[in-house]
Structures are given as C-alpha cells and as structure tokens.
C-alpha cells in the first residue's frame, strides 16, 4: 500500500486543463526530495514529464507545471491544453528515481462530446448574463415563442411569449425581439447561476411546423488565479467584475468550506484580522478595484473571491473573481517587530526593511487609516515633506546598503498609536506594517533639555543642554537640526564622556549644543538623541525661537554665561557649515503608479511647510563645548 | 442548503453487487467534491471514494486501497447524484455508507472529514451469506 495518495482515475475533455493533487506523508525528508510526475511505457519504464528538479519534457513545454506545496504536504501537476494523446497511465511520486514512493493515475482525454448538429455552444461565467438567439421561419411569426430546459426526455417551460417564466428564473430571463427582425427572438439569461447549465431549447411554433434550435448553456466558476507570496510580503487582488456592476458595493471575501467570509467591502466592513493591514481601492468608473494586503501571515493562505453586490456580501448569481493564495515561509523578508511601545512625551525609533538591492530607492512611510475602504497618507519621504502636524517630530534617516531605514517620530502623544506602513518605490513585496502604542508616561523622560524655552537673541552665543540618563553612558549622543528633509547631525559636545563609567553621575550626565553667534535662519527644531552606529533609539525635541537683540540688553546670554563658568577654560569654538536646501521633492510618480491609496505627500508640498522650517539655513553655525 | 439522501443500500451475499446513490438537493455548484464513506460497528468512519468535477468536465476519482478495482464511483450529469458502484462484495465491507459534499473543488484532502460541508443520514450495507 503506497503512502502517497491522489485520484486514481482523471477524466477531462480535450482542449482542457487538469490539475492533479498527490498527497505526501508529512515529513521532513518528503517535503524537500525530489517531485515527479511520469509516464508509464509498455516496458515497464516510467519516463519523466516533470518534476521538482526543474526538469521539463518537451511534449509537456509551456504547457505544464509541477508546485510543491510543503505546508500542505502536497504537490500539484498542472497540465492545459490536454490532447487525446496524453490519455494513459502515469505516476506521481517522491523520491530521486521513478521507483521510489509513487501513485497511479489514470488519464483520459476525450473529444468534445457531440450535439446535435444545430447546437449553439454559450459559455458563461457565472453571475453574468447570455442572450440566446432563436431563428425562426416566416410562417411562425405570429405563433407562441418559448425556451425551455431539458430534463432528461422532457423540456420544462424557462419562458415563453405569453409571458410566464419559471419561478426559478424570476427576473432573470426575458423574451425579446430587436427593432423590426421577423426571424428571430432572442432570451436574456441573467445572473446566471451553475445550475443554469445545460441543454436548452428554442421553439416558434406548435407541432410538426415549429422551428426549433438547441443551445448548450455551460456556466463556468472561475478558475482562482494562483499567487505565490512571501511570509510577511505583500499582495494585490486586482479585480475587473466589469461595466454592469460599476455602482454596486464591492467586496473581497476569503473561502471557508461553503461560505465566503467578508475581509473588507466598500460598505465600511473589515475583518478585524486585516486592521491596519488591507486598503480597498477602486481604479476607475467601470468597477474595477484592487485590494492591497500587507504584512502576509501563514494563516492569510488560502481562497479569495471578490464580488459585487448592492448588500456588499456575496450573492449567487453575482460576477465573481477568485484567487488561491500561498504563502511561503521561506520568505526573504526579514521577520521585524509588529508591535512598538512608547509612552506620551517620549519616542520611538521604528526600523524599516527594505530589499538591499534597492538601496537607492525611494523610501517612504505612511499612516493606516481606518475611515472609508482604508487609506495610508504618507508622513514622510527621503524626498517628501513631511506632513502638517508632524513637523519638528518626524524623520526618516537612510541607512544606504544596510537593507533598512529608520522613522523616528518623538513628542508622542495617544493619537499617534495606530498603524504605519513602511514602504518603497521599488519591490512592492517589501511593506511592513507595524502597530505603534502609545500609553500615559508614568515617569520623567530619559532625555530632558534645559532650557526649555529656548529663546535664541540674534548674534549672541546660546548653549541648549540634553540630560541623559546612566544607562545611555556608552550610547553616542548626538544633537540634529530638523528639517523638512531630515534631521542633519550637528557638532555636539558630551560632558559626561570625561568620567570613568564606574563613577557615573546622574546629574551631571550632558550633551550641548552650541549656537555661535546665532543667526535668523538658526530658528526652528533641535533634536536630541542616542544611537548605537546605525541603530537610533530616544530622541527629545525643542524649539529654538531666534529674536533680534532689543536695545540696551547685555550681550550676553544667561544660558551660555552659567555654562561658561561652568567649564572654564574657554575652549575653542568648532565651526560647522550644516546645508539645508530648500526642499521641492515630489514622490517619484511610479511608486503608486497603480495604488492611489497611499497619499501623495508630494503633491502638498508647497503648502505643508512650517514657516519657521522653510528657507536655507546657509551658513548655520554649531560649537561644541 | 445542500441535502443529501443516499439510497441503495441493503443485504446481499459476498462476491455480489450493489448500487449507492446519493442525491443531492437546494444550492448545486458546478465544481465540487463528492465523497463516500463508511462506518462499520464499533469503528471509526473511514473514508471510501470521493469525485470532483469542475464547470469544464475533467473529473478526478479517488479510492481508498481496499476497495480499488472493485468499487467504481460516478457523477450522474442530468441529475445532482453520485453512484457508487460496489463489485466483489466482502464482509468487511459491511458498514453504514454516508455521503458528504463540499464546494471545495480539487482543492483539498477528498479523505479527511474536515473537507465536507453536508452529509447524508447514511444507509446500511449488510455483506452476509
């Protein structure tokens, strides 16, 4: 008795496809050998068609496929185009010989079966409608016209011209003639259902003189399209259900044994499952719309079928689009953390991935949005603006060829937990979803600045100081200018560098800053943080506000004056010219070419930039002291 | 919904044959599995034979070891039903016979229970002399 198990026997007709499932006893040696399906000859040898070498036979070129699934213990021979001459005996099997473990199938191909000879052959998928054209003779012009279905010897009444239809095609079927055509009626079918399938008959007239004409009715489930996907990629369901149901409620729903589970409809309904993790997004007027997956979970494999309907549920005898998804657990994605924590007043730091090839990408990251099918408005961009309401708290910093980029956003309060999307405009698998939290600080932040109401005056010195904490005492400190384009590392200095880490004080552990002499354009936001190389942690922001110098007041700025008693000698003061050009970044139009969804921040611009973070900070100065 | 009423079932003599039918009723789909399985005294239901199709007309017929070359499974097209025919009866083959169907297509295991949505109340094969 052979362990592998699949359909013994395979039926189909020629010009079809099949697709043959062989079962594998789940373990870890037959998910990884060797897959193949042969062909059984009169001597006993069984010759390769396919298999999970990579092995393709001519007579099965471009015609056949051979996709291990491991999950499942499965793997599946597809083969289209079917001839009679494939019809025989093959086995499907494991193992590095065709002798090893295997299964018998059989395969028979047949012709097209044969109708009568007047047979028109309708194909139709379902939920769609066919119009079936019925010929008659001059002499039955004024007789009763009808359609029927055959039920074995009998054909039972679908419609006729004195108006009765059957009860189970109620408001689906009409009878009708075009303009002044005295030879033929047609029957309109709609909404068509599987069990619509089949042989019917037209008729014009009663007895021996009446014309009649057979129609073949097949009414097709789709075919799921297969998507492979990565662990923790991302996928797109596009679908075209077509004109005739462009203002009808649209909906994806994932296949549960008979019912069709709603994931998210235009009618606001989202399976809690997807949250922060899924946008609807219709394309154009004629019903097309795609549906984007991000963050792919083992669990998300499975069926998909998107439809339309007024309800925005499923419904028979409504188009449908059906797809099977895989997802592979060998993904190159690397596995990153789902879920950041941060407490009001404080930071975090959230590390993107992103393919290395692309290092030269554009990266991008955005906000989740519930409302309406879901949105993603981007925040910040390596060339967009950042967005209204996160000036001053949001950068992006690349870290070129490390195959991630990190978002840091500081001053958080409760609104900002919910669900961000790091993304790029190069390989669209690479989006990672990530669940930010906020709770209520219950303590003092790590990172304090004094003063804190910084107030700059016009050509005087002025030293803003950054606390931190013991246990940042090995961390590299840094203090960076915000701007509309990042955050651009000044020269700092560490105070609390000079002790030995044994004797670390907690009062007297200081990063400053200096500005020397101040200049207008040295307004505007000034981040304090630690990072380890290129890993950032806690960062904390001021506002630094600049002011001409009023008459009569002393040149001298109090801050700067204590810090100066503080650390005489008087030291040097190190020059540095930190650039900022004037940000006119637009996002690059192919990076949502085809997902309107994600907003571009691009297009608001010119009008998202903050007054006191517009301008070129030329000749910004900083001394470290 | 979908219901399903076997019939068919009875006494005969070992080496005899019989035919199962199993009908089904309400919602129909144009591609789905149809599977038998029986259940003798005091055992575990085990799986027998199963057929998918799909709205193309390819076929796929499955069989449990004990019972390939004896027992033939097939679609009736005009109808909802599913035969089974039963050759070579033996006495092991006495069990209550259930019929299932699922609209999952060739997608699944047809042996495991778990892939049928409807079931029949089952009919009673008795293979004694």
């Known amino acids: 008795q052979s362990p592998i198990f699949g359909p013994q026997d395979v039926s189909s007709i020629e010009g079809n496809s099949v697709s043959i499932t062989c079962y594998y006893p789940d373990t870890s040696v037959n998910r990884h050998t060797r897959k193949y399906w042969c062909r059984q000859g009169a001597n006993g040898y069984c010759a390769t068609l396919i298999s999970s070498n990579g092995y393709l036979s001519k007579e099965y070129s471009g015609r056949a496929s051979l996709i291990n699934f491991p999950e499942n213990s499965t793997f599946v021979i597809n083969i289209a185009h079917l001839t009679q001459e494939d019809t025989g005996s093959y086995k499907c099997g494991l193992g590095t010989t065709n002798r090893g473990l295997f299964f018998d199938v059989s395969l028979e191909v047949s012709q097209v079966p044969e109708f009568p000879n007047d047979t028109h052959v309708y194909t139709k998928d379902i939920g769609r409608t066919v119009t079936i054209e019925c010929r008659f003779k001059e002499g039955n012009a004024h007789s009763k016209k009808s359609l029927c279905k055959k039920r074995g010897e009998a054909c039972e009444v679908v419609i006729d011209s004195t108006e009765y239809v059957d009860p189970s095609y109620k408001d689906r079927a009409i009878l009708f003639m075009k303009g002044t055509s005295r030879d033929i009626f047609y029957v309109n079918i709609s909404h068509l259902i599987p069990s619509d399938a089949g042989l019917y008959v037209c008729q014009a007239g009663e007895g021996p003189s009446a014309d009649k004409n057979n129609a073949d009715l097949q009414v097709l489930e789709p075919e799921p399209e297969l998507l492979y996907k990565d662990l923790r990629s991302s996928v797109t369901f596009e679908c075209d259900l077509g004109r005739e149901v462009a203002n009808d409620a649209k909906y994806l729903c994932r296949k549960n044994k008979e019912t069709c589970d709603v994931i998210i409809n235009t009618l606001g309904k989202r399976d809690p499952a997807f949250e922060g993790r899924i946008l609807l997004t219709p394309r154009d007027d004629n019903g097309r719309f795609s549906v984007l997956i991000t963050g792919l979970r083992k669990e998300d494999a499975g069926h998909y079928q998107c439809g339309a309907h007024s309800s925005g549920l499923p419904q028979e005898g409504w188009p449908v689009q059906a797809w099977q998804l895989f997802v592979n657990e060998e993904s190159t994605i690397p596995n990153s953390r789902s879920v950041v924590k941060g407490v009001t007043g404080g930071s975090v730091a959230i590390v993107c991935p992103y393919n290395p090839k692309e290092s030269s990408s554009l990266k991008y990251w955005c906000h989740w949005e519930a409302d309406e099918n879901g949105r993603c408005p981007v925040l910040v961009g390596t060339q967009a603006l950042v967005q209204e309401g996160y000036e001053g708290r949001l950068a992006l910093f690349d870290q070129p060829g490390s195959g991630a980029y990190t978002v840091i956003l500081n001053q958080l309060t409760t609104q900002d937990s919910g669900f961000y999307w790091c993304l790029t405009d190069g390989d669209s698998r690479w989006r990672t979803t990530i669940e930010l939290q906020v709770a209520e600080a219950t303590k003092k932040p790590d990172l304090e600045v004094t003063p804190q109401n910084a107030t700059a005056v016009i050509g005087e010195t002025f030293t803003i100081s950054c606390h931190y904490p013991c246990k940042f005492y090995s961390q590299e400190k840094y203090w960076c200018k915000w701007s509309n384009d990042g955050c651009h590392i000044l020269p700092s200095h560490d105070e609390g560098a000079r002790q030995s880490s044994v004797s670390c004080d907690q009062s007297s552990q200081i990063v400053s800053m200096t500005l020397n002499p101040v200049k207008k354009e040295d307004e505007g936001w000034y981040w304090c943080g630690v990072k380890e190389g290129q890993v950032y942690g806690e960062t904390t922001a001021i506002y630094v506000a600049v002011e001409e110098r009023t008459r009569g007041s002393p040149h001298i700025n109090p801050t700067d004056a204590n810090a100066r008693a503080k650390d005489a000698p008087e030291e040097e003061a190190m020059e540095s010219s930190v650039r900022e050009d004037e940000n006119k970044a637009n996002l690059d139009p192919r990076l949502f070419a085809d997902e309107r969804e994600i907003q571009n921040a691009g297009d608001q611009a010119q009008e998202n930039r903050a007054s006191g973070n517009a301008g070129s900070a030329g000749g910004q100065s900083g001394s470290s002291k | 919904e979908v219901q399903l009423v076997e019939s068919g079932g009875g006494l005969v003599q070992p080496g005899g044959s019989l035919r199962l039918s199993c009908a089904a009723s309400g919602r129909t789909f144009s591609s789905y599995t149809m599977g038998w399985f029986r259940q003798a005294p005091g055992e575990e239901r085990e799986f027998v034979s199963a057929?998918?199709?799909?709205?193309?007309?390819?076929?796929?017929?499955y069989y449990t070891d004990t019972v390939k070359g004896r027992f033939t499974i097939s679609r009736d097209n005009a109808e909802t039903t599913v035969h089974l025919q039963m050759n070579s009866l033996k006495p092991e083959d006495t069990a209550v016979y259930y019929c299932?169907?699922?609209?999952?297509?060739?997608?699944?295991?047809?042996?495991?229970?778990?892939?049928?949505?409807?079931w029949g109340q089952g009919t009673l094969v008795t293979v004694s002399s």
């Open positions: 299932a169907a699922s609209s999952s297509g060739t997608y699944g295991d047809p042996r495991s229970e778990r892939e049928y949505r409807y």
């Open positions: 057929i998918s199709w799909s709205s193309d007309g390819t076929y796929y017929k």
